[in-house]
């Protein structure tokens, strides 16, 4: 069930300007993917893979595009929210 | 449905710290931010800080560095401010309230806490 | 830091008119990665914490009523109330998150004419 934040995000992610979204490497995504604790849940990767991903942000995995994002905190841009807002 | 709750109110000495806090509900706690907002007595709002508890993010107005620590606990969506050596002047209404986000940005407060009366007193 | 400088400090409409608060940056708020200015207004109410009424200077949020509108961009902004309703007497700030420290207006009194 998605969340009214996750929708937004997704809406952000698939429509806005390239700086919304952050996508490593292709190969990265190729890996298998392992269950996490619990019946067949599968652990969000922003909470260990990509922990560190966001600079100045916070990481949103999107499943759909199988990616991280970032939602940056204020003054920041750019994918990883690495830059500073002049 | 989304909820902030914070301590109840708190009265202080010159020079003491006080732990005030804020238990969320209703939400994924580490999707947002939870940034602080004071109110003395008739005055407007000012800013002293947020964390970001997925991230563990903080940042402060300049004007609390160093007596204002922010701090979050995940396992139960609580977040704190304490504030050290206190003063008269810290006498206000502290809120804390939820940060959110759009457009990929964050910066709104779209949720609050009912408040935190502290009084500092002699 | 970012100014923000509301004008009037307060305010007194008739029910039914019109109320308008001005708001004004010591700096530019549009972001120029998403073309969107960085401002939120709040309502407040005695013994109340505030209420968010608009983000992005012109999103309203959800649940608040059509009569509130934002607009605006760079560094002056408004927000308009169109038919003033007697729930509506109460304290508005804007508020910047263009960058840190996020600041807030000193405020403006709305009271009924």
């Known amino acids: 069930d998605l969340q009214e934040a996750d929708l937004d995000l997704l809406r952000v992610t698939l429509s806005s300007k390239p700086q919304a979204l952050a996508t490593p490497n292709k190969e990265e995504h190729g890996k298998r993917k392992k269950k996490g604790k619990g019946l067949g849940k599968k652990r969000d990767p922003c909470l260990r893979k990509y922990k560190d991903f966001c600079i100045h942000g916070e990481c949103k995995y999107v499943k759909e595009l199988r990616a991280p994002s970032c939602i940056c905190h204020p003054g920041y841009h750019g994918e990883r929210c690495h830059g500073l807002s002049l | 449905q989304v909820q902030l709750v914070q301590s109840g109110a708190e009265v202080k000495k010159p020079g003491a710290s006080v732990k005030l806090s804020c238990k969320a509900s209703?939400?994924?706690?580490?999707?947002?931010?939870i940034t602080w907002v004071r109110q003395a007595p008739g005055q407007g709002l000012e800013w002293i800080g947020e964390i970001f508890p997925g991230s563990g993010n903080t940042y402060y107005n300049e004007k609390f560095k160093g007596r204002a620590t922010l701090t979050a606990d995940k396992s139960t969506s609580t977040a704190y401010m304490e504030l050290s050596s206190l003063r008269s002047e810290d006498t206000a209404v502290y809120f804390c309230?939820?940060?959110?986000?759009?457009?990929?940005?964050?910066?709104?407060?779209?949720?609050w806490g009912q408040g935190t009366l502290l009084t500092v007193s002699s | 830091d970012i100014v923000m400088t509301q004008s009037p400090d307060s305010l007194a409409v008739s029910l039914g008119e019109r109320a308008t608060i001005n708001c004004k940056s010591s700096q530019s708020l549009l972001y120029s990665t998403n073309q969107k200015n960085s401002l939120a207004w709040y309502q407040q109410k005695p013994g109340q914490p505030p209420k968010l009424l608009i983000y992005w200077a012109s999103t309203r949020e959800s649940g608040v009523p059509d009569r509130f509108s934002g607009s605006g961009s760079g560094t002056d902004f408004t927000l308009t109330i169109s038919s003033l309703q007697a729930e509506d007497v109460a304290v508005y700030y804007c508020?910047?998150?263009?960058?840190?420290?996020?600041?807030f207006g000193q405020g403006t009194k709305l009271e009924i004419k």
């Open positions: 508020q910047q998150y263009y960058r840190y420290p996020l600041t």
């Open positions: 209703g939400y994924t706690f580490r999707t947002y931010g």
């Open positions: 309230a939820r940060e959110s986000f759009s457009d990929g940005y964050y910066g709104y407060f779209d949720y």
